[in-house]
């Protein structure tokens, strides 16, 4: 699909409407200009055309007024003031505080642990196909064939770590060269970055809180994604990374350190390993060729086990097959040696809910997988809504000018330099990358923090992670301490590399504008987020992995030609905005191409279709919980529900629970009061610290 | 307790055959391997060869392969060697043995031994 | 096959004395190695095995060491009834081998 053109600061008729055009939308006004409104009016933008940016017709059809769609939202403060409060008012307005932190902490606690139990279904689910993966020979011959091993495992188990300290102990058993690891390292960056992606997704109710969300998740992976574009070429050509670590690795004298602190997981472990415990060295042994482990299940059964050191006779069919000449002998018909055998006598069984279930591993995972999602949505759905009721009027204001203000001239460059050191500390404490950026995404989502700030946090979490396998790296044994250094420092000195090419210089950070020009095509067809998270990490990956079993040739016979079209897209669109003159009148704008592949609207016309027959059967149930919900939160006209029930209650005749359009949803409050049913002072339901 | 009852002495010409008997008792016969060794007169011990009774494998010096066979019959706990074309230096005690210590050349239980004299 | 070298081939001492007998494997053998005593016209009596484990029976005075390709046989204290010809025996490799055998006699 040919990309849309992006216009200038020319903003074109709104009936005349450019997808994708990062920053271009508009989009539904600012909720706090609000008026009473049951449609659900998407953007007032529908129709599309296709504008070339030098047309007069972008300049004359000026709206009067446009809103930033990537402006942060203003959180009205719809509460009593403190110092307007009586003593009652002041003791009952500390305790819902101090009640709203406690249920934030335990939300968030929650999502991280939900993220962990995510982590272990994934594993259940797709680990040994993961562990497989690896072993494949071509990994060491073909950069490409490990980037997107790297990348699809790490998917699959969800966690770079895993997939990192398998490259590791196969580097260590020399199965694997530091110079093939690099790429798999480089792979599993990308693929550490669809956690939030997933997070993001989670707020798809909201569509502007969608679209901030999804580009704040996003801008991770389009760093990673970019990053390697460059330096995977790079790195094959001169070998830079493999050159500079090695280099580090054998200038330093490292002696064993200690273990990287496990930070959060003291506090996470206690919950997650009570849902479920995994072994997670069967992945690695797939990984390594083991054939027994592939019938090994990933679900920890024994927790307490007593090995045994034990030399063992064996025979063997000759002399030559001994342990050692010293170690050989004969009965007079067999020849026998001494083998080491580890005997394993089970002690004590773990206490996890699967342990006594003898269910497949695909089984556990997927009902961890449901749960683990259920479990995310919901807390992050709760996160979202405290954080909403808490950062309001002056509490938002201080807050979002803390994290969003820069230093005062000349220091405002040091900033986002800053914010990279403040990723990469938050992400060391809570040991994670994924936790951090995911934990991120909704602050992005409701407004809390720009983009251009989470994307130097992104920066510094990808750093962050880097530094936890440092750690990790000097407490490894003898043999595996200069790999898995050497490895870690790969991925450090890739993540450096990356910073120093899409951050320094403003006019290089890409993955904002990437970031951004995907919110605004999710934000208006939002079942485009799922197929970018489809096709970004599996379907390409996917394509690859078979291209490069089928051999460099085809690979090579294929991927030419895919190449040479996406650059001749990427030239003609530059030409088309930068200097259009030069280009056949056919070949200004994409008009010349049909409908399909310059819009994305017949797409949207077909995915409705495929979806409109559920729509019928999910609004019966949507309209239940919707209105259980409503009880619950004692607003019988606040109901959140999805475009469909609303199509149907207004189908039906005496309709008494008025629906909302889902992307102007905010707190409760300032919907009700949007809609003039409660007074701005009602203390009942808000309560402001400030 | 563990006996081994080996057949009588022979007097055998140059070039003939003899097969010897050792008859096992006190333990289950197919555990253990069975060692056959041979004393020349005045002389040190000389490892023929071995059987494992349970599977029928066979072992065997080389010096002396192509001329000796050991057999086995699980039925009547019976070792037998067959020693052919048979020469003036063959001369000796030939002594059936089996090894309790398992998965060791070391035997421990010995039969008294069967003389083989080899005069024309 | 492995040559097993015994020296001496024969010694005479006195009752109470110790007697060391040593056995050459020709080449490393670890420590499969067995010996026998064996007395006039009787069949040869397992002694030692895996180069220093008595068998069921041995008294004391018998003791083996070595390893690789040196072992030898020690009788702490000789008595009477130790009147013999002693044997080493490699089972290290097929064929198992005999040492030549000392003549242990008493003065």
């Known amino acids: 699909m040919a990309p849309w053109p992006e216009l200038g600061d020319a903003q074109p008729n709104p009936d005349k409407y450019l997808e994708g055009a990062a920053g271009q939308q508009p989009t539904a006004p600012d909720k706090s200009k609000e008026t009473n409104k049951t449609d659900n009016t998407e953007a007032p933008v529908t129709k599309i055309e296709l504008l070339p940016s030098y047309s007069t017709a972008t300049l004359i059809d000026e709206p009067t007024e446009v809103d930033d769609p990537w402006n942060l939202p203003t959180l009205q403060d719809s509460g009593i003031k403190w110092s307007e409060r009586d003593t009652k008012g002041k003791i009952l307005c500390f305790f819902q505080g101090i009640g709203r932190l406690i249920l934030l902490l335990g939300f968030l606690y929650f999502f991280v642990c939900s993220l962990d139990i995510l982590s272990s279904a994934f594993q259940l689910v797709g680990g040994k196909m993961a562990g497989q993966f690896f072993s494949n020979s071509s990994i060491m011959s073909n950069p490409l064939l490990g980037l997107v091993i790297g990348v699809l495992v790490t998917v699959l188990v969800q966690s770079s770590s895993t997939s990192t300290s398998i490259v590791v102990s196969m580097v260590s058993s020399s199965l694997l060269t530091v110079r093939a690891a690099i790429p798999i390292i480089m792979g599993a960056n990308i693929g550490t970055s669809i956690t939030n992606t997933i997070v993001a997704l989670m707020q798809v109710g909201d569509r502007s809180e969608f679209r901030r969300a999804f580009a704040g998740a996003t801008v991770h992976d389009f760093f990673n994604w970019l990053s390697v574009l460059v330096l995977l070429p790079v790195e094959v050509a001169t070998h830079y990374l493999e050159i500079i670590t090695q280099l580090i690795v054998e200038s330093f004298h490292f002696k064993n350190g200690e273990d990287a602190p496990d930070l959060l997981k003291v506090i996470t472990k206690p919950f997650t390993k009570l849902i479920v415990q995994l072994d997670k060295k069967v992945i690695s042994q797939i990984a390594m060729n083991d054939e027994k482990a592939k019938n090994k299940s990933l679900v920890k059964i024994w927790c307490k086990t007593f090995t045994n050191k034990t030399q063992i006779n064996v025979t063997v069919p000759s002399t030559a097959n001994c342990t050692s000449p010293s170690l050989c002998w004969t009965d007079g018909i067999q020849n026998w040696t001494m083998k080491n055998v580890t005997y394993k006598e089970n002690i004590a069984k773990c206490q996890h809910i699967f342990v006594n279930f003898h269910l497949p591993d695909l089984a556990v995972g997927t009902i961890l997988l449901i749960l683990s999602l259920l479990v995310l949505c919901g807390c992050l759905i709760m996160i979202v809504k405290i954080l909403g009721s808490v950062l309001k009027g002056q509490v938002a204001t201080v807050i979002k000018k803390t994290i969003n203000t820069d230093f005062p001239f000349p220091f405002a460059w040091l900033t986002g330099y800053l914010a990279i050191l403040v990723g990469a500390g938050m992400t060391f404490i809570v040991q994670s990358s994924s936790v951090f950026t995911s934990a991120l995404t909704p602050l992005i989502g409701i407004g809390v923090i720009t983009i251009e700030r989470a994307y130097p946090l992104t920066l510094g979490s990808n750093i962050g992670t880097t530094t936890t396998a440092i750690l990790a790296a000097l407490a490894s044994p003898g043999n595996a301490l200069r790999s898995s250094l050497q490895i870690a420092l790969c991925h450090f000195f890739f993540n450096i590399s990356g910073i120093l090419l899409w951050y320094p210089i403003p006019f290089t950070r890409l993955p904002i504008r990437m970031a951004k020009g995907l919110g605004n095509i999710s934000a208006k067809y939002r079942w485009f987020a799922v197929f970018y998270l489809i096709i970004f990490f599996f379907l390409i990956p996917l394509t690859v992995f078979g291209l490069s079993l089928a051999g460099w040739r085809v690979l090579v016979g294929v991927g030419v030609p895919v190449v040479f079209i996406i650059i001749l897209v990427l030239c003609l669109r530059l030409l088309q905005s930068r200097c259009p003159r030069v280009l056949p009148k056919k070949l200004q704008n994409w008009n010349f191409l049909p409908l399909w592949m310059r819009s994305l609207k017949p797409w949207d016309a077909v995915v409705s279709k495929f979806t409109g027959c559920f729509q019928m059967r999910c609004c019966c149930c949507c309209r239940v919980c919707c209105r259980a919900c409503c009880l619950l939160c004692d607003c019988p006209k606040c109901c959140r529900c999805s475009k469909c029930c609303e199509d149907l209650e207004e189908a039906q005749e005496g309709q008494d629970v008025p629906v909302k359009a889902p992307e102007t949803f905010d707190n409760i409050t300032i919907s009700r009061e949007a809609q003039g049913e409660v007074p701005a002072s009602d203390s009942k339901t808000e309560c402001t610290a400030l | 307790q563990v006996q081994l009852v080996q057949s009588g002495a022979e007097v055998v010409k140059p070039g003939a055959s003899v097969k010897m008997s050792c008859k096992t008792s006190?333990?289950?016969?197919?555990?253990?391997?069975m060692h056959w060794v041979r004393q020349a007169p005045g002389q040190g011990l000389e490892w023929i060869g071995a059987?494992?009774?349970?599977?029928?494998?066979?072992s065997y010096n080389q010096k002396f392969k192509g001329r000796v066979t050991l057999t086995a019959d699980k039925s009547t706990s019976t070792a037998y060697m067959e020693l052919s074309s048979l020469r003036s230096e063959d001369t000796a005690v030939y002594y059936c043995?089996?090894?309790?210590?398992?998965?060791?050349?070391?035997?421990?239980?010995w039969g008294q031994g069967t003389l083989v004299t080899v005069s024309s | 096959d492995i040559q097993m070298t015994q020296s001496p081939s024969s010694l005479s001492t006195s009752v109470g004395d110790r007697v060391t007998i040593t056995c050459k494997a020709s080449q490393d053998v670890g420590t499969a190695v067995a010996w026998y005593q064996q007395k006039p016209g009787k069949s040869p009596k397992l002694l030692i095995y895996?180069?220093?484990t008595r068998h069921t029976g041995v008294p004391s005075r018998f003791s083996g060491s070595g390893s690789g390709t040196d072992f030898t046989l020690i009788i702490s204290s000789l008595q009477p009834e130790d009147v013999a010809t002693y044997y080493c025996q490699q089972y290290s490799r097929i064929p198992l081998t005999f040492g030549g055998g000392t003549k242990v006699e008493i003065k």
């Open positions: 895996w180069t220093s």
């Open positions: 059987i494992y009774p349970g599977s029928g494998d066979t």
């Open positions: 043995s089996i090894s309790t210590i398992i998965t060791t050349g070391a035997v421990d239980y």
């Open positions: 006190g333990y289950t016969f197919i555990t253990y391997n």
